[in-house]
């Protein structure tokens, strides 16, 4: 309900006798406000008083009336200044001014906190003309006030290029406390102190804070807002909230969970994304982080061969992106792989171990002890070698690749021969006489071609020369062996 408070008809200052066009009791009320506001409307009003210091809200007209009496300064009448009401109540307030009829087209605008109020506001201006003056009443109503309606309202009227400004009407909307800072969820170390903050404002103030832990009040006596709760430490998860109390009632903050940091759970779903001869790309799904961010992870790799010495290779990596390429592995080998991750509290247990295998690779070493000699009777070059060590074959040998380059008087041609895996000798036909033949051999697996051996050179003379001495792979350190026949 709206209570109406009416201003009594009062003489206009500087006018002798009654003020022309003074308001009658059946006119629009000058102030309306809810019962809840705590006002005594009869005490709210007083006439405009001359000699006030706040200039800028009075315009002194230069015109005189028909009787040549000087016109009074124009000023808005006083109304209630500070209106206090509860949220969601209705309020109506106004500005009133009496303007001599010589002024035309007077408009009144409403302003809040220095900004003009335009659009969807309930502002009504009513005119009450009389012989000499027109009483203008600008009313502003808010049907259900909200906190955002708090502030200073003024009326402005432009007249003769002068701006007349009313005294402010301050609307104070009182309601339940409004949180400006609520406690935040936290992850804390066991038995370590931490702080929670709660801040709420009115009006009305003061706002008092009670803290609640797991549905029980923490503090017997309320603390004035803002309040900081120091919790000496927790051993298990707890839920905290704060209650903000003022004269209008109580508002409860959101409940926040305070978690105790722990070691993470082991990663799950370790899987093989890709395998090569010497590397395995793995991925994993991190386990629960124990309320503390993962710092890094450790990949543990064991040879799955029962005859291996059981040593574990450890590779450390960042926690993201849950992917790691394990390198320096042997080809065609079986491995057990486990992953463990750590946070600030410690390491998780190792994930379930998974089996993974590397693929065949190209051999990592060349055939050894390559020897080359000329069999002139058959016009062939005989080549012999030793196969690379099994461990360094990186797969099952499928054969060898022989490169032989023939160089003579500026002509050079390279030929490649493929030889089966059985045996360790080969015979190639002499391609050019009076030339140098350079031979290199590589082992071949399904994984590819290994490195070629160091070159071995043999001179093939013109027909009729005899050669009994073989050429062979040099001892390490000899760069480019040539056998002179």
């Amino acid at each position: 309900a709206i209570t109406e408070a009416r201003e009594e008809a009062k003489p206009y200052p500087l006018f002798p006798g009654p003020f022309p066009g003074s308001l009658q009791t059946d006119h629009t009320p000058l102030l309306s406000l809810p019962h809840a506001s705590g006002y005594q409307p009869a005490l709210m009003f007083s006439p405009t008083q001359p000699g006030r210091p706040h200039t800028g809200n009075v315009a002194i007209p230069q015109v005189t009336s028909v009787e040549s009496k000087p016109l009074p300064p124009l000023a808005f009448k006083h109304t209630v200044g500070h209106i206090i009401l509860s949220e969601h109540k209705g309020v109506k307030f106004n500005c009133s001014i009496s303007v001599p009829n010589i002024y035309q087209d007077t408009t009144i605008s409403w302003w809040k906190d220095g900004k003009e109020l335009l659009g969807a506001h309930h502002a009504i201006t009513q005119f009450y003309p009389d012989d000499e003056v027109t009483a203008i009443i600008a009313s502003f109503s808010i049907t259900s006030v909200q906190r955002s309606d708090n502030g200073s309202y003024i009326c402005k009227m432009k007249i003769n290029n002068e701006e007349i400004v009313s005294d402010p009407i301050y609307i104070e909307v009182q309601g339940l406390p409004h949180f400006t800072k609520q406690p935040e969820s936290m992850n804390v170390t066991r038995n370590t102190a931490f702080n929670l903050t709660c801040q709420a404002v009115g009006p009305p103030e003061p706002v008092n804070i009670f803290w609640v832990q797991n549905s029980s009040r923490v503090n017997e006596q309320p603390e004035k807002s803002p309040s900081v709760l120091t919790v000496p430490g927790l051993t298990e998860m707890a839920v905290f909230s704060c209650e903000a109390h003022n004269d209008k009632g109580l508002t409860v903050s959101k409940g926040v969970q305070i978690n105790i940091k722990a070691i993470p759970s082991p990663p799950t779903e370790v899987s093989i994304r890709n395998s090569t001869a010497h590397s395995i790309l793995i991925s994993w799904v991190p386990g629960f982080d124990g309320y503390s961010p993962f710092r890094n992870c450790s990949i543990q790799v064991k040879e799955a061969d029962p005859l291996s010495n059981g040593s574990v290779m450890i590779f450390n990596t960042s926690a993201l992106p849950h992917l790691y390429q394990i390198k320096q592995l042997q080809a065609l080998a079986n491995y057990s792989i486990g992953v463990s991750c750590m946070n600030e509290i410690g390491w998780s247990a190792v994930s379930p171990w998974i089996l993974a295998s590397t693929t065949e690779g190209a051999p990592s070493v060349a055939p050894l002890n390559v020897t080359v000699f000329l069999n002139e009777s058959s016009d062939n070059v005989d080549i012999r070698w030793m196969k690379p060590p099994t461990k360094q074959q990186d797969g099952e040998l499928v054969g060898y690749r022989i490169s032989h380059v023939w160089q003579s008087a500026g002509i050079s041609k390279e030929l490649l021969e493929e030889v089966g895996q059985n045996g360790s000798r080969a015979r190639i036909s002499v391609q050019v006489h009076n030339a140098t033949c350079t031979v290199r051999i590589a082992a071949v697996t399904r994984g590819g071609v290994g490195p070629f051996s160091d070159p071995v050179k043999i001179f093939i003379p013109a027909h009729g020369w005899v050669d009994y001495a073989p050429s062979s792979t040099p001892a390490p350190g000899n760069a480019d062996p040539v056998l002179i026949i």
Partner: antibody
Framework: SLEESGGRLVTPGTPLTLTCTVS????????LGWVRQAPGKGLEYIGI??????TYYATWAKGRFTISKTSSTTVDLKITGPTTEDTATYFC??????????????????WGPGTLVTISL | DIVMTQTPASVEAAVGGTVTIKCQAS??????LAWYQQKPGQPPKVLIY???HLASGVPSRFKGSGSGTQFTLTISDLECADAATYYC?????????????FGGGTEVVVR
């Protein structure tokens, strides 16, 4: 809460700066005023700094005092040329209403305990 | 500036009695008036604002009234704890300035 500091004994004419340190108060939302009280006398309003940083002074205080916001939690009152008449307890006080406005109804809701300034030869 | 005149300067009353303090503004301040209580060695504490509105936690024995230039603070059912100095304050303002001023104070002695 509010707490004044910087009050001490100085000789006339020696500039003096008092500081009001606030906690749990957002100075971008509230005005902060200074009020003094001479020994055995009444309260005397000096001036105020609004949430927007606009300053207003009592007529008698203009030119003699300067109020400034020095950080998000401190407001200073500078007494430019103190005389023995400026001997008083100086209080800082928070305006009652929040809002980023240059002016408003500034009665004082929260007060500091005060700091004593003595001006003597 | 607005000048606030407070009367009387001192008043004495018995426990259970009533005290009335008046405050006059040199010009109309509407209802922009607050009342404070101050005890020795302490900062002031707001009792009433908007001329008649009781601040939080203030007993209803304190009553403010008035508007314009004439204001009254009435303390009924006096208690020993009410012994203090009481000040009125104008906090009138316009769109260009602020007109804060305190009254001279009234000492209330409770016997």
């Amino acid at each position: 809460s509010l707490e004044e500091s910087g009050g001490r004994l100085v000789t006339p004419g020696t500039p003096l700066t008092l500081t009001c340190t606030v906690s749990g108060i957002d100075l971008s939302s509230y005005a902060l005023g200074w009020v003094r009280q001479a020994p055995g006398k009444g309260l005397e309003y000096i001036g105020i700094i609004s949430s927007t940083g606009t300053t207003y002074y009592a007529t008698w205080a203009k030119g003699r005092f300067t109020i400034s916001k020095t950080s998000s939690t401190t407001v200073d009152l500078k007494i430019t040329g103190p005389t023995t008449e400026d001997t008083a307890t100086y209080f800082c006080a928070r305006g009652a209403y929040a809002g980023y406005v240059a002016f408003g109804p500034y009665y004082f809701h929260i007060w500091g305990p005060g700091t004593l300034v003595t001006i003597s030869l | 500036d607005i000048v606030m005149t407070q009367t009387p300067a001192s008043v004495e009353a018995a426990v259970g009695g009533t005290v009335t303090i008046k405050c006059q503004a040199s010009q109309s301040i509407s209802n922009f008036l607050a009342w404070y209580q101050q005890k020795p060695g302490q900062p002031p504490k707001v009792l009433i604002y908007a001329a008649s509105h009781l601040a939080s936690g203030v007993p209803s024995r304190f009553k403010g009234s008035g508007s314009g230039t004439q204001f009254t603070l009435t303390i009924s059912d006096l208690e020993c704890a009410d012994a203090a100095t009481y000040y009125c304050q104008s906090y009138f303002y316009s769109s260009t300035s602020i007109y804060n001023a305190f009254g001279g104070g009234t000492e209330v002695v409770v016997r």
